[in-house]
């Protein structure tokens, strides 16, 4: 209810606009399976309105419910490739805080070479989103091959 | 009813409520890769408001940051048809005006018969989304398998 | 400026922010390919608020424009347990009542051990959403690998 | 701005090895990636080798175990050494670096007996 009466003085910012759309700047070193994104209208048709990038990854900024999408490509890829080198499998999850660590979404290429999802899921302010590719593989940087991108849906 | 009160202060356009879902209509000629969209209440469950069709094409009314979506089904196809076939590519982009033409999100079929993706883009008016399926294949006209849309997200 | 200063006369629930993310719950017995769904926060990072559960199948409260979305993993999958199975298909339509009854989406595994989509579609007041499973292969319960929603876009 | 030059390619027999140099005008440590492609005439430009700036690689299934590639980040060079050349490997060579460049001229590599 409090919402409801508060909601009446609210000007566009607060309707929590907040949304993302990234594209991917490297990979980390062997050892780490995080890929590193960067956003901003000098990089093309990536933004940032809202959330933040710390270190290469998306940090949220608003309570509320989010939709969150990726689509991911390998570079150098074929289909015997995919299943040469399986399994390499993204996964979407809170990295931090550690309290609230959790895998949100995951699949696998098996004889793919991109993998594309979305869903619906909560996330708090001070939320860190990490996208961790594991296996050999290396993602392509093309701008319409490999993006990660959240909408703010509601409190 | 309160829905309909309240909206009364605030005419619905101009939350740019501009959505859109198209169905397939027909693919071009021979040296033609562009697919050709319909829509409206007539044809089933696709609609267009806000979004125009241009000679099957789809053209944006109102600026702002849209979630594009889109899946294509091929229609005769198993993963050997798919691979041998291959490459077969979907690409979404701009077409038109030819200062803003770029691509906006691009998959291949591999060994699988279903392409389905979407993501978060800026959009102005007037610009005129191009899907394009490069290969010998044709996609199904079935229109659970076969559905391209977008949606206005923020100014 | 118009958008901020009407925005003071719209409360938050007639804006119909119904929305809804599932986790898989079982499947129907032999003869039955429908999924059963759960949600709600005791369970993890599902919900429902507005759209409700029958029978863990997802009932639509609101009338309007929804964003349909899924993803669905096989338990036990390699590309070769999803060829030799083949077809694994999975639908989403509108299964009661019988008058509106449609398939809205319609994915086939071929290859691959992960489907996902999502598509904009009018639904009603009432309308029930089935998501049939058809074949012998088991959805993963892991609600990062198979889960479903719904978002209300626009009136 | 980044120019890239290509050199080391030949006429090699069926089984005989080439290794390609392409130097860079600018820091390797620069770009994601630094790959080696190949163009048979009619046909797409291949992608078959990359080097991320951190050292990780990847091949296309037609040349693994074959061609090899690395860097001299002294000398802002990067290699590819092929060996076990078929007649398939036939095509022109460029190195290009992701985000892209300029094409090069290339490095024609021919296997034939």
């Known amino acids: 209810q409090r919402f409801a009466q508060a909601q009446q003085q609210l000007p566009l910012e607060s309707l929590g606009w907040d949304v993302a759309e990234l594209q991917l700047n490297h990979t980390g070193p062997q050892q780490d399976p995080r890929l590193y994104w960067q956003g901003g209208p000098a990089l093309g048709r990536s933004f940032l309105h809202g959330p933040e990038l710390d270190k290469g990854q998306l940090r949220i900024h608003r309570d509320g419910i989010y939709m969150v999408h990726i689509q991911v490509t390998l570079a150098i890829c074929s289909s015997t490739t995919a299943s040469r080198h399986h399994p390499t499998t993204l996964a979407v999850g809170i990295c931090s805080p550690a309290s609230r660590s959790i895998s949100l979404l995951r699949l696998s290429f098996h004889q793919g070479c991109t993998i594309a999802s979305q869903r619906l899921t909560p996330l708090a302010r001070g939320d860190t989103l990490c996208t961790n590719l594991t296996g050999t593989l290396l993602p392509s940087r093309n701008t319409d091959e490999t993006f990660f991108g959240v909408q703010w849906v509601r409190p | 009813q309160r829905f309909a009160q309240a909206q009364q202060q605030l005419p619905l356009e101009s939350l740019g409520w501009d959505v859109a879902e198209l169905q397939l209509n027909h693919t071009g000629p021979q040296q033609d890769p562009r697919l050709y969209w319909q829509g409206g209440p007539a044809l089933g469950r696709s609609f267009l408001h806000g979004p125009e069709l241009d000679k099957g094409q789809l053209r944006i009314h109102r600026d702002g940051i849209y979630m594009v979506h889109i899946q294509v089904t091929l229609a005769i196809c198993s993963s050997t048809t798919a691979s041998r076939h291959h490459p077969t590519t979907l690409a979404v982009g701009i077409c038109s005006p030819a200062s803003r033409s770029i691509s906006l999100l691009r998959l291949s079929f591999h060994q699988g018969c279903t392409i389905a993706s979407q993501r978060l883009t800026p959009l102005a008016r007037g610009d005129t989304l191009c899907t394009n399926l490069t290969g010998t294949l044709l996609p199904s006209r079935n229109t659970d398998e076969t559905f391209f849309g977008v949606q206005w997200v923020r100014p | 400026q118009r958008f901020a200063q009407a925005q003071q006369q719209l409360p938050l629930e007639s804006l119909g922010w119904d929305v809804a993310e599932l986790q898989l719950n079982h499947t129907g017995p032999q003869q039955d390919p429908r999924l059963y769904w759960q949600g709600g926060p005791a369970l993890g990072r599902s919900f429902l608020h507005g759209p409700e559960l029958d029978k863990g199948q997802l009932r639509i409260h609101r009338d309007g424009i929804y964003m349909v979305h899924i993803q669905v993993t096989l338990a036990i999958c390699s590309s070769t347990t999803a060829s030799r199975h083949h077809p694994t298909t999975l639908a989403v339509g509108i299964c009661s009542p019988a008058s509106r009854s449609i398939s809205l989406l319609r994915l086939s595994f071929h290859q691959g051990c992960t489907i996902a989509s999502q598509r904009l579609t009018p639904l009603a007041r009432g309308d029930t959403l089935c998501t049939n499973l058809t074949g012998t292969l088991l959805p993963s319960r892991n609600t990062d690998e198979t889960f479903f929603g719904v978002q209300w876009v626009r009136p | 701005q980044l120019q890239l030059v290509e050199s080391g390619g030949g006429l090699v027999q069926p089984g005989g090895s080439l290794r390609l140099s392409c130097a860079a005008s600018?820091?390797?440590?620069?770009?994601?990636?630094i790959g080696w492609y190949r163009q048979v005439p009619g046909k797409q430009r291949e992608l078959v080798a990359l080097?991320?700036?951190?050292?990780?690689?990847n091949y296309a299934d037609s040349v693994e175990g074959r061609f090899t590639i690395s860097t001299d980040t002294a000398r802002n060079t990067v290699f590819l050494e092929m060996k076990s050349l078929k007649p398939e490997d036939t095509a022109v060579y460029y190195c290009?670096?992701?985000?892209?460049?300029?094409w090069g001229q290339g490095a024609q590599v021919t296997v034939s007996s």
């Open positions: 600018v820091s390797i440590f620069t770009f994601y990636f």
């Open positions: 080097i991320t700036s951190n050292g990780r690689t």
């Open positions: 290009n670096a992701d985000p892209s460049t300029d």
